[in-house]
């Protein structure tokens, strides 16, 4: 999100680790490889981050600018309703979902989409920048 793009916020961009991108006060990691939802969550936690939790429509639009048609896991699960990993409800967007068996959430450039958690997808981690 740095490197002279329109999202560059200041000269302190390199405060995120290698292969992570900075926006505002956060660093984001967009994976290339694919994992199931739980493995993606574990990857993020092992790096002192969490699977992407989106706070509002503005952040969602920003992130979608960086995504292709490929879906990426986010920290969203249907656990007594669609909730982010911190327990807050999904209340600023709808999520496409074909079936109640699809209990994990993913994002691409166009939408949020429910999927079976066992599917292997890319993922996005997020953490507060140093």
């Amino acid at each position: 999100l740095c490197q002279g793009s329109k999202y560059s916020t200041c000269a302190s961009c390199p405060s995120c680790p290698d292969h992570w991108m900075k926006y505002g006060n956060h660093c984001y990691y967009f994976s290339v490889e694919k994992k199931d939802w739980i493995s993606s969550l574990e990857f993020c936690l092992a790096r002192d981050s969490h699977l992407l939790m989106i706070t509002d429509k503005q952040e969602m639009s920003l992130l979608q600018d960086f995504l292709s048609e490929a879906f990426h896991w986010v920290g969203l699960r249907n656990n007594s309703g669609w909730r982010w990993e911190d327990g807050s409800p999904l209340n600023f967007s709808r999520i496409y979902s074909n079936s109640l068996v699809q209990t994990c959430g993913a994002i691409n450039k166009n939408s949020l989409q429910a999927s079976s958690c066992e599917v292997s997808l890319q993922w996005v981690c997020k953490k507060v920048s140093p």
Partner: antibody, heavy 119, light 107 residues
Framework: QVHLQQSGPELVKPGASVKLSCKAS????????ITWVKQRPGQGLEWIGW????????QNSEKFKDKATLTVDTSSTTAYMELHSLTSEDSAVYFC????????????WGQGSTLTVSS | VIQMTQSSSFLSASLGGRVSITCRAS??????LAWYQQKPGNAPRLLIS???SLETGIPSRFSGGGSGKDYTLTIISLQTEDIASYYC?????????FGGGTKVEIK
């Protein structure tokens, strides 16, 4: 356009079982959950359970766990609900419905199958 | 299990009048709410999902509103074809649950 065609009225004796059908046409059958809903005469709507045609996974509400068995035949794009150990309380109209694309609300409905349980 | 309560079982209104049908959830449902219309002998028909999103083909005199636990379906100019029962349904949580219904009649 999705169309759900349900089987006709049934008159069955207490203690028996009955199998209702719901044939889907006009869209990919395996894509969305099929749900069953009960409506007793003059009463409201009650969710029975759903089945995901792609893999046959089901979930029933607690009340209907032992009462209803949901199955699908993907080759004929038909969903079935078998009701067991029938009593007069099971006399109702039963609807099949397809879930919406944003969650388990129901955007397409069958016309309903009337079940009468009487000796 | 989230309980859905429609406080009025019956509502009377004049043709051309405004009707507001209310629905209350026992817990927050974050706008994950649908409204249906049902006429005698027919299946329910989806009017609104997501508390406010009108389904394709539904007349614009129908609208939905509300948030949190409290939601409203409004018909701004009642027509004879709107005489029916109306049901709310939450789908925030499994199992999805319906309100008891509100029957709209002509005054």
């Amino acid at each position: 356009q999705v169309h759900l065609q349900q089987s006709g009225p049934e008159l069955v004796k207490p203690g028996a079982s009955v199998k209702l059908s719901c044939k889907a046409s006009g869209d990919t059958f395996t894509t969305y959950d099929i749900t069953w809903v009960k409506q007793r005469p003059g009463q409201g709507l009650e969710w029975i359970g759903w089945i995901y045609p792609k893999d046959g996974r089901t979930q029933n509400s607690e009340k209907f766990k032992d009462k209803a068995t949901l199955t699908v035949d993907t080759s004929s794009t038909t969903a079935y609900m078998e009701l067991h150990s029938l009593t007069s309380e099971d006399s109702a109209v039963y609807f099949c419905a397809r879930r919406g694309q944003f969650g388990p609300y129901f955007d397409h409905w069958g016309q309903g199958s009337t079940l009468t349980v009487s000796s | 299990v989230i309980q859905m309560t429609q406080s009025s079982s019956f509502l009377s209104a004049s043709l051309g009048g405004r009707v507001s049908i209310t629905c209350r959830a026992s817990d927050h449902i974050y706008n994950w709410l649908a409204w249906y219309q049902q006429k005698p002998g027919n299946a329910p028909r989806l009017l609104i999902s997501g508390a406010t999103s009108l389904e394709t083909g539904i007349p614009s005199r129908f609208s939905g509103g509300g948030s949190g636990k409290d939601y409203t379906l409004t018909i701004i100019s009642l027509q004879t074809e709107d005489i029916a029962s109306y049901y709310c349904q939450q789908y925030w949580n499994t199992p999805p649950t319906f309100g008891g219904g509100t029957k709209v009649e002509i005054k």
